[in-house]
């Protein structure tokens, strides 16, 4: 499918706002430093030279590959070296090792300031005056921080963020109708921005197959009356998608989502019941709404898996005759009967067969020696079950904000050379499961819980990729994808760790601290809390318990002060003391 | 283990041709993508090009695009680069290298756990 010209083929077939959105998208991600308005002008003259490939597209330069196209455009800033250091190094590769080179330099930490949220009436006022410029902003901010947000889908979220102020702007309480929307929208950004690095960190780390493998397991489950082949290729296109959008191609991307939401649409009767609903919206929506339907009902009729993969005699022949297809069909049958389980559950125990067969069919008897293979499945499930069982029953009976402690401290013991604020971040999201998943039905639990805490555990290990520091977090994060989460649940207290000094500054607190949101406090407070267990890590729950309780009371006593700065001068002194006596 | 063995390098004329194989032996299988890198002397390994084992897609570094073409025979587990219009600067050590996972990054040496030994084309009058 060669076109002339591929801008050309790619404004024709996306069109002028959503081609201008996401090459602002993908110039935001690359170059995460630079100003808006340095943007919005190389997006202009980037869509003005398409528009001239589309009038003629044998017009100079029109057969140039996007990448060739897109990246001469990022060479042209003239802060590059400056702002970007090594990355102004890559303008000196050629195609397609200039475009790769850019991917690798993405920063999945930048250093750039939150986002404040101005006064309603501010941003009603903004939006009104240039509504065109206030989306961009929106796609440039959110894109910069998230250099791996899923791109046709960050244009949904624009679609919503316009909406939401088209009609909260005109409401008598613009507050009350807008606030609550902007929250949902920010939560929901991070989800899904946290979802789609886990999806392209499985395409960069470990794979084409990898990524496969937990497609086939999940659209399984989504799709349990569909057949394998029309699973195979579902899992096929969307494969190509995301390789596309993780590789910078966000165009082809969105455009190849567009074509699969429309053959989904096409074949619904061979695919599920559940996507009537989706296919009557239009695009952008259409396509969230696919990637988010609930799983459908599982065929009455099922026979016993081990008819096929235990009990037949040409187990071992049909293993090798196709490796990868006979294990692509084990792992849909079992997932198709199993929504249940975690995706992760479903490739380890993918995986532990491949495993048997790998053993057994080298055996002299090979059937004899996989007779047994479905019974080794059961430590498998029972781990993430009694993991799950145990961490909802400490989330109902502490809630979440002690949940998250009790996290913070696990995870510290566990990993203490990981900075703070990561594992702040890290440990608080972790502890976001509770409220997440343990409210579901036990059939809910497993999958809603497991799914998340690896999408979590990922950011972990990208932001330790960054800057390594521990070891046992590189071995977690490098050896096996979907081992990650019991790799890190298996860890213990790290006994070669040397102890972090005291420093009081650490415990230095002020008047401002009376000030903030109750988030922020809570931060303060478990950044405090990491900052105690890295100076004592054998120290005993209990022990924690009293220092965090003389905290919290300490910090409540001088929020009420009428000299606040004045008491925090005095009673912090005397509650770092306490603590220490109590530690020691 | 896989192991990876090429041929074909020599010495040819501007404008002539030449076509390296890659003969691979022990697990390859169908998620392997096979490459070629090369390195001139005193510069770094760079990507000339690379194809999926499964499903034949094929990139290209642009120097090479339109004169090189990558090809491979899965029956006898080789793999191919046909080198049409050489100039001086396509003088290098050419190596075949191995992705058995097909990771993201087809351009990244990094990526590739397998390698061959290197064979030297020389393009000069």
């Known amino acids: 499918d060669t076109h002339k010209s591929e801008v050309a083929h790619r404004f024709k077939d996306l069109g002028e706002e959503h081609f201008k959105g996401l090459v602002l998208v993908a110039f935001s991600q690359y170059l995460q430093q630079c100003p808006f308005e340095e943007h919005v002008k190389l997006v202009n003259e980037v869509t003005e030279f398409a528009k001239t490939c589309v009038a003629d597209e044998s017009a100079e330069n029109c057969d140039k590959s996007l990448h060739t196209l897109f990246g001469d455009k990022l060479c042209t800033v003239a802060t590059l070296r400056e702002t970007y250091g090594e990355m102004a190094d890559c303008c000196a590769k050629q195609e397609p090792e200039r475009n790769e080179c850019f991917l690798q330099h993405k920063d999945d930490n930048p250093n750039l300031p939150p986002l404040v949220r101005p006064e309603v009436d501010v941003m009603c006022t903004a939006f009104h005056d240039n509504e065109a410029t206030f989306l961009k902003k929106y796609l440039y901010e959110v894109a910069r921080r998230h250099p791996y947000f899923y791109a046709p889908e960050l244009l949904f979220f624009a679609a919503r963020y316009k909406a939401a102020f088209a009609e909260c702007c005109q409401a008598a309480d613009k507050a009350a109708c807008l606030l609550p929307k902007l929250d949902e929208l920010r939560d929901e950004g991070k989800a899904s921005s946290a979802k789609q690095r886990l999806k392209c960190a499985s395409l960069q780390k470990f794979g084409d197959r990898a990524f496969k493998a937990w497609a086939v397991a999940r659209l399984s489950q989504k799709f349990p009356k569909a057949e394998f082949a029309e699973v195979s290729k579902l899992v096929t296109d969307l494969t190509k998608v995301h390789t596309e959008c993780c590789h910078g191609d966000l165009l082809e991307c969105a455009d190849d989502r567009a074509d699969l939401a429309k053959y989904m649409c096409e074949n619904q009767d061979s695919i599920s019941s559940k996507l009537k609903e989706c296919c009557d919206k239009p695009l952008l929506e259409k396509s969230h709404c696919l990637a988010e339907v609930e799983n459908d009902e599982m065929p009455a009729d099922l026979p016993s898996l081990a008819a096929d993969y235990v009990e037949s005699k040409d187990v071992c022949k049909n293993y090798a005759e196709a490796k990868d297809v006979f294990l692509g069909m084990f792992l849909y049958e079992y997932a198709r009967r199993h929504p249940d389980y975690s995706v992760m559950l479903l490739l380890r125990l993918a995986k532990a067969y491949e495993a048997t067969l790998e053993k057994c069919c080298a055996a002299a008897d090979p059937h004899e020696c996989y007779a047994k293979v479905f019974d080794e499945f059961q430590p498998l499930v029972e781990e993430p079950q009694n993991l799950v069982k145990q961490n909802c029953e400490l989330f109902e009976q502490l809630g979440e904000y002690k949940f998250q402690n009790a996290l913070l401290v696990r995870y510290t013991k566990k990993v203490p050379q990981v900075s703070t604020p990561t594992l702040v971040e890290v440990s608080r999201n972790l502890g976001k499961v509770g409220a997440k998943c343990c409210k579901l039905p036990e059939a809910k639990r497993m999958p809603c819980a497991e799914d998340y805490l690896s999408v979590v555990l990922n950011r972990l290990c990208v932001l330790h990729e960054k800057t390594p520091v521990s070891e046992k977090v590189t071995k977690c994060c490098t050896e096996s994808l979907v081992n990650r989460r019991p790799c890190f649940s298996a860890l213990e207290l790290d006994e070669a760790y040397v102890p972090k000094a005291f420093n009081a500054e650490t415990f230095t607190f002020h008047a401002d601290m009376c000030t903030l949101s109750e988030k922020e406090k809570q931060v303060k407070k478990q950044t405090a809390l990491v900052e105690l267990v890295k100076h004592k890590p054998k120290a005993t729950k209990e022990q924690l318990k009293g220092v965090m309780d003389n905290f919290a009371a300490f910090v409540e006593k001088c929020c009420k002060a009428d000299d606040k700065e004045a008491c925090f001068a005095e009673e912090g002194p005397k509650f770092v003391a306490a603590s220490q006596a109590a530690l020691a | 283990e896989v192991q990876l063995v090429e041929s074909g390098g020599g010495l040819v004329q501007p404008g002539g041709s030449l076509r390296l194989s890659c003969a691979a032996s022990?697990?390859?299988?169908?998620?392997?993508?096979m490459g070629w890198f090369r390195q001139a002397p005193g510069k770094e390994r760079e990507f000339v090009s690379a194809i999926n084992w499964s499903d034949g897609r094929t990139y290209y570094a642009d120097s090479v695009k339109g004169r090189f073409t990558i090809s491979r025979d899965n029956s006898k587990n080789t793999l191919y680069l046909q080198m049409n219009s050489l100039r001086a600067e396509d003088t290098a050590v050419y190596y075949c290298?191995?992705?058995?996972?097909?990771?993201?990054?087809?351009?990244?040496?990094?990526?590739?756990?397998?390698w061959g030994q290197g064979t030297l084309v020389t393009v000069s009058s």
């Open positions: 290298a191995a992705d058995p996972d097909s990771r993201l990054y087809y351009t990244v040496p990094q990526n590739y756990d397998y």
């Open positions: 022990g697990s390859t299988d169908s998620a392997y993508r």
